[in-house]
Interface confidence: low
């Protein structure tokens, strides 16, 4: 807490300008009017204040707006935003995408801080859903943003917003998240033709069910091994050797290098060895010829 001391004669600030960088902390506290500061916040960011001085300016704004800053001030916080705590930010009502962008710009290049996470949370809750413009903005600043959301939060993403998602935005998503995003993507891209559709849907296929993979295998899509390895194991297991061959096209040869890894390993165990042999890749571990394959999942469903 800065002590309340009278402003020395002639030092009362008429405007927020560079002369203030020569003020000691107590002089800033005593000589800068909080209302003046609030109306000239856009200048603060362009003045070489020390961060001790910025602490004083923040303190003045906190006193002026104990219930939380108005958006007109928030939009111009600039580097003062880095001084805010999540508790401060929870008091804000940020509705403008421009304000959000301005504050994310300040934090650009940093990891997502607790302050930024709180700001985004406040903004999205205020909007009620993750619309396309918001998602566009957030993924531009934080490619991993989408995958930081819970499946429940992702359920509020409208299919139209999926157009804003880039492949790298999904890199860290787990299967539970892709399970939520895939149906939305399928809906968003449903009117595209075969090859264009596959390019768009490819990143989301970690959430695709078996029947969709079977359908894709009929479309000469030539799925690469990296995408195949991210598919749900339970969705891959029912695929026949012929379907996998059609799905992967020329990339089928890559199965050999992945034969010890899921889902390839588990899929091999479910295939007849003579079917695997037709691929000519030397894949081993299939069901020997003459053995009966019981579909236990079907048996369980009947009992």
């Amino acid at each position: 807490e800065v002590e309340k001391t009278a402003c020395p004669s002639g030092k009362k600030a008429r405007e927020i300008d560079e002369s203030l960088i020569f003020y000691k902390k107590w002089e800033l506290e005593a000589c800068v009017d909080a209302a003046l500061l609030a109306t000239q916040m856009d200048r603060v960011n362009a003045i070489p204040f020390t961060y001790e001085q910025l602490d004083v300016l923040k303190h003045k704004l906190d006193e002026l707006y104990p219930q939380g800053y108005p958006e007109s001030v928030i939009q111009h916080l600039g580097y003062l935003f880095l001084k805010m705590s999540p508790e401060d930010i929870r008091k804000w009502n940020v509705t403008s995408l421009e304000t959000l962008k301005a504050l994310l710009e300040v934090n650009k290049g940093h990891e997502m801080s607790p302050q930024v996470a709180t700001l985004i949370d406040r903004f999205v809750k205020g909007r009620g859903q993750l619309d396309k413009d918001t998602l566009d903005t957030l993924t531009a600043f934080y490619p991993g943003y989408l995958c930081s959301l819970s499946p429940e939060e992702l359920s509020s993403v409208p299919p139209s917003s999926i157009w804003a998602v880039r492949p790298q935005d999904l890199d860290t998503c787990d299967p539970r998240q892709l399970d939520v995003l895939y149906p939305k993507a399928r809906l968003a891209f449903q009117n595209m033709n075969g090859s264009e559709y596959f390019v768009k849907i490819q990143s989301f296929l970690g959430g695709a069910p078996t029947e969709d993979l079977k359908a894709l295998s009929q479309q000469n899509v030539s799925m690469d091994l990296a995408t195949f390895m991210k598919l749900r194991t339970d969705a891959v297991l029912p695929l026949t050797v012929a379907e996998v061959q059609k799905l992967l096209g020329p990339h089928v040869e890559g199965l050999k290098a992945e034969e010890r890894h899921r889902p390839v390993r588990d899929w091999i165990l479910r295939q007849r060895q003579d079917d695997l042999d037709t691929l000519g890749l030397g894949l081993q571990g299939g069901i020997p010829n003459g053995y009966l394959v019981l579909d236990l999942s079907m048996q369980e469903a009947l009992s």
Epitope: E18, A46, T50, G78
Partner: antibody, heavy 119, light 109 residues
């Protein structure tokens, strides 16, 4: 991309003045302060001062007060540093550097201008 | 004149970890952010670390900064021959404004 391009090397006699230019491109010139930093041969970096290209406001290091003048021409996005009453110990590479908003850091630097003071 | 103190030189073998210290006072490092600059031979300085420990995009995560009280340090792990350069710490001083350390020459053995 952001670039700061400085004028070429200069050789001056003691007592003379030198004016070094720094042309900015790739960003809004008036949006960031410009600093001048010098480096004598085999020595460290020494901050000389800062100018706000919008208003022309300047702040000089005490050591150079009275000898240095920093100006700018916003129409050609160029900052200038003039050092007068040159002496041999002013022989150095002079750099302009863009001040990054909010903290005292210099995120982009010019390539440097060698000023040699010799009789 | 120099208010931030750095060791004149440090050295290390390729792959090793080295640290460069920077000592100041309460009027500079103690109350402001520290940045670090790398100056390769014959070139202009380049921003390496800012706000004590932040890396600009493009700077490898082998470089890291830290600060405690009135001292700061730069750590370089997995030393590479191209890291051979001069390194400067810098901050803002209440009395003299922008300040730099004297610089540390890093030699990769």
């Amino acid at each position: 991309q952001v670039q700061l391009v400085q004028s070429g090397a200069e050789v001056k006699k003691p007592g003379a003045s030198v004016k070094v230019s720094c042309k900015a491109s790739g960003y809004t010139f008036t949006g960031n302060y410009i600093n001048w930093v010098r480096q004598a041969p085999g020595q460290g970096l020494e901050w000389m001062g800062i100018i706000n290209p919008t208003k022309g406001w300047t702040l000089y290091a005490q050591k150079f007060q009275g000898r240095v003048t920093m100006t700018r021409d916003t129409s050609i996005s160029t900052a200038y540093m003039e050092l007068s009453s040159l002496r041999s110990e002013d022989t150095a590479v002079y750099y302009c550097a863009r001040w990054h908003h909010g903290t005292w850091i210099f995120d982009y630097w010019g390539q440097g201008t060698l000023v040699t003071v010799s009789s | 004149d120099i208010v931030l103190t750095q060791p004149p030189s440090v050295s290390g073998a390729p792959g090793q970890r080295v640290t460069i210290s920077c000592s100041g006072s309460s009027s500079n490092i103690g109350s402001n952010y520290v940045s670090w600059y790398q100056q390769l031979p014959g070139t202009a300085p380049k921003l390496l670390i800012y706000n004590d420990n932040q890396r600009p995009s493009g700077v490898p995560d082998r470089f890291s900064g830290s600060k405690s009280g009135t001292s700061a340090s730069l750590a370089i792990t997995g030393l590479q021959s191209e890291d051979e350069a001069d390194y400067y710490c810098s901050t803002y001083d209440r009395r003299t404004f922008s300040v730099f350390g004297g610089g540390t020459k890093l030699t990769v053995l």
